[in-house]
Interface confidence: low
């Protein structure tokens, strides 16, 4: 557990008056329909709110939408619907907000049936002004910004055309027809799949993968017999149909598709799927579905090339393609991921890894909790976390697990304590050390959010009744104060705070219901006067992440290095502030065999950390190759785990062997690739 002071819960002084002076109500002059909210830019305070209301008429539906803008983090809103000519905005496209602090916004309008194309409203000044633009096509997808240049947009049309704009949607050009899926890569590159015969669905498995690096002036076919493709970190993945049958395999490229390698993963059949669970520039977590409608599969973790994979976790819960998985990256501590497995008895259990998938364990039972009815042994059980799957099953779980990179070590989640996830009403648990230890934080289900980089946690009870009370904690969830933010309870619909958890403002959204109408209402509470002073050096304490044995010199070593952080003391009531930067100091650890994975053609026998040469290569190993051609594979059997920074210590260098073998996949041999220009 992270360092903190055990003390009686002290009340924050005069908080009611302080919060009352900083509570701002806004009633929207609007019939209740749906509402969507977007933050424009970082630390700008600009929020756009789009409300839509559908009036069903006998033959058709009449729609009405309103657009509101705040520039003070939601304390006040102005109706700016006239800036978009009172046009009805299509909510399924949402508000397309530009990357970084570009200030760009695109809204897609509803147009009448006979029109030649769609209509968009564009702003490049944080929604102060909008320009109406009529499109030469009907959009099928939301406009997608290039991550590198927010003036470059792409969209697919309802006719499967790929359209690109180079001037932030002012002028559009169709650069390719018959396109199924398009994605921006790095350096303004666009990857897309095309069909030759009937349609995307009919040609699945016979699609071609194309690339353009100059916004459609020239193209290169970089793959054939494609089922689908995906981008993750620096890796480009394609699932490719095998020559002889209906199975497909993953191929990977780290050079934008110029050269490919077959990933050493099992092939999948028609009813199965691959899914990239998480990826960064070092490695990828890949889920491979089991045959049959099992609802589970296997997680594999890659080497630094994305080629060699180690089995990470069996029976990983993942319902169907595009279905539900509980896989969660705990962003508040390096190397930590949480997910669910489906056990033999069909119960669902939570597992956690602290070393990027190297080992998985159950979550430690919170000290202040009893084992529930799912536990065979009332003294031995674990915490099980509710995530996407529980939410999809309509359990009483209003929110998925929450962590923030700048609130170091903090993880908040709904859970139950037993042998498996329980269908009973869950409680809210918190970890302050990245998932090693847990404490019950709140009884029953709640909405929760993190403010001021962890300096404040805010929660609202999940209830079917109207509410008017918010809870907050200034000590990482140990002690809670309650504040009545309105005399008239509202039907609560959501908590909104600026992404990044740096803000001290929270907006409570809901609606009021009277006899004839219901109206949207928001209450924005600014906690700045609760945290009245800026934090100083004395408010922080040193914390060693991943520490499990302080007596061990290698304590805290994960992936070859340890990190010490400056953490806010639980007893300090002060502002980290918007400019707060996590202070951390890494130090390198000595290498052990645990820092290496077994390279292609090698394996680890049970309970042994050494990599042993496989007596013979068989099955999919024999197909595995580099760059889609015959290749000399040289290896000493070990490869450092991606992202591992250890130095010295064990150096498992031994005789380098040639694993000469014929590559049986000529999926992407150079002669199959071709280039052409527009």
């Amino acid at each position: 557990s992270a360092p903190g002071e055990d003390e009686e819960c002290g009340r924050v002084r005069d908080f009611v008056a302080k919060l009352a002076n900083n509570t701002h109500q806004h009633v929207f002059d609007d019939l209740r329909g749906s509402v969507s909210l977007s933050w424009v830019g970082d630390s700008t305070g600009v929020i756009l709110v789009l409300t839509t209301f559908h009036v069903p008429l006998v033959i058709m539906t009449f729609g009405q939408s309103k657009l509101y803008r705040s520039e003070d983090y939601g304390k006040n809103f102005k109706d700016i619907t006239d800036l978009i000519n009172n046009t009805f905005i299509r909510t399924e496209f949402g508000m397309a907000i530009g990357p970084e602090n570009s200030g760009k916004v695109v809204l897609t309008a509803e147009v009448s049936g006979g029109s030649r194309g769609g209509r968009i409203f564009r702003s490049s000044d944080f929604a102060k002004n909008f320009v109406q633009t009529d499109l030469p096509f009907h959009p099928l997808t939301q406009m997608m910004y290039s991550p590198q240049n927010s003036d470059y947009l792409l969209a697919l049309s309802t006719e499967n055309g790929l359209w690109v704009s180079k001037n932030f949607g002012g002028k559009w050009e169709e650069i390719h027809k018959a396109v199924c899926l398009a994605k921006w890569g790095s350096d303004n590159t666009i990857f897309f799949t095309t069909y030759a015969n009937g349609s995307c669905k009919a040609d699945l498995g016979a699609l071609e993968l194309w690339r353009t690096s100059d916004l459609g002036k020239s193209f290169k076919t970089i793959g054939v017999k494609i089922y689908s493709f995906g981008l993750g970190g620096r890796f480009l993945f394609a699932s490719v149909m095998a020559d002889k049958d209906t199975t497909r395999r993953i191929h990977v490229s780290t050079d934008q598709g110029d050269t490919w390698s077959m990933a050493q993963l099992p092939s999948v059949g028609q009813e199965q799927f691959y899914s990239i669970l998480a990826a960064n520039d070092d490695m990828v977590f890949m889920h491979v579905d089991e045959p049959g409608d099992t609802g589970f599969g296997t997680i594999f973790t890659s080497d630094d090339r994305g080629i060699v994979y180690s089995k990470s976790l069996d029976r990983h819960l993942y319902t169907t393609t595009g279905g539900e998985t509980d896989f969660t990256n705990v962003t508040s501590l390096r190397g930590v991921y949480i997910t669910s497995v489906l056990s033999e008895d069909n119960s669902i259990q939570t597992m956690i890894t602290f070393d990027q998938g190297g080992r998985w364990t159950h979550l430690r039972k919170p000290e202040n909790s009893e084992c529930d009815a799912t536990a065979k042994n009332k003294n031995e059980c674990s915490l099980h976390i509710h995530a996407s799957y529980s939410i999809s099953q309509k359990l009483n779980v209003p929110m998925a697990p929450l962590s923030e990179p700048n609130a170091v070590g903090i993880v908040i989640a709904h859970g139950s304590v037993g042998d498996a996830i329980s269908v009973m009403v869950p409680d809210v648990y918190i970890s302050d050390d990245g998932g090693y230890s847990w404490t019950k934080m709140l009884e029953g289900p709640h909405y929760y959010t993190i403010l001021d980089s962890g300096g404040i946690i805010v929660a609202i009870e999940h209830s079917s009744r109207p509410i008017n009370v918010i809870k907050f904690s200034t000590d990482e969830g140990q002690c809670w104060q309650t504040y009545t933010f309105t005399r008239d309870p509202i039907y609560f619909t959501g908590l909104a705070s600026e992404p990044g958890a740096r803000s001290m403002n929270i907006s409570i959204w809901g609606f009021t219901e009277s006899f004839l109408t219901s109206q949207w209402v928001s209450y924005t509470i600014d906690f700045k006067d609760i945290l009245e002073r800026n934090c100083e050096e004395k408010d922080y304490t040193i914390w060693l992440a991943h520490s499990t044995d302080p007596e061990d010199y290698e304590d805290g070593c994960i992936l070859g290095y340890k990190e010490q952080f400056l953490r806010l003391r639980k007893s300090s009531v002060c502002q980290n502030g918007r400019d707060y930067v996590v202070t951390k100091q890494p130090s390198i650890c000595l290498c052990s065999l645990e820092d290496f994975l077994c390279d292609f053609g090698y394996y680890r026998p049970e309970n042994d950390s050494k990599c042993v040469e496989q007596p013979e290569l068989k099955g999919h190993d024999l197909e595995f190759c580099l760059y889609g051609r015959e290749e000399h594979l040289t290896t000493n059997g070990y490869r450092k785990i991606p992202g591992d920074k250890c130095q010295g210590g064990v150096n498992p260098v031994r005789e380098v062997k040639d694993l000469k073998k014929k590559c049986t996949s000529n999926f992407l041999s150079p002669e199959k690739q071709n280039s052409k220009s527009n």
Epitope: T541, I542, Q564, F565, L566, T583, K584, Q585, S587, I588
Partner: antibody, heavy 118, light 110 residues
Framework: EVQLVESGGDLVKPGGSLKLSCAAS????????MSWVRQTPDKRLEWVAI????????HYPDSVKGRFTISRDNAKNTLYLQMSSLKSEDTAMYYC???????????WGQGTSVTVSS | QAVVTQESALTTSPGETVTLTCRSS?????????ANWVQEKPDHLFTGLIG???NRAPGVPARFSGSLIGDKAALTITGAQTEDEAIYFC??????????FGGGTKLTVL
Amino acid sequence: EVQLVESGGDLVKPGGSLKLSCAASGFTFSSYGMSWVRQTPDKRLEWVAIISSGGSYTHYPDSVKGRFTISRDNAKNTLYLQMSSLKSEDTAMYYCARLCGPLCSGYWGQGTSVTVSS
Amino acid sequence: QAVVTQESALTTSPGETVTLTCRSSTGAVTTSNYANWVQEKPDHLFTGLIGGTNNRAPGVPARFSGSLIGDKAALTITGAQTEDEAIYFCALWYSNHFWVFGGGTKLTVL
């Protein structure tokens, strides 16, 4: 403002004892490991002792091991160095210092002079 | 016992950039050695400049920065000033014998 103020230095005979004190202010004393460092007449710096933030761990170089004892009183924000069996080579200016591991910056006191001579 | 070596003396001019280094006899200096840099001015006035390789102490001018250069720890003074004339010591942390100081570099600013 961070301040470390040493006291207790003196002229002492070989074999004698002396106790140095260091009063700390301006930072959370109980959060940091603290050290004693000495500067010998030839201007070399030598680390003499270190104590963990809570006082559980102490370490010394071989040159003073068994003769010097570092301790702290976190309630009084004070660091101590008990020196016994003093030798002429212990003659030096003694500094109380927050030498820093990963996450802090170093602070030094103004020093207190110890002379071991017959 | 590890030995920490520094340049015995360096001379620079006002406004110039000067880099002092700190070498370890046991091999490359890493972040795990938590290099500390200390300035000594006349009358035994010691000031901690840098801790943990690159953490500047509060109140220390931004022209002082710590880093690792090759296999050594380094203190760089960007735009040296006459008041920077002093002796600079580095201290390295070793897991088996704790803090070891270098012999100091006398910096002259002419």
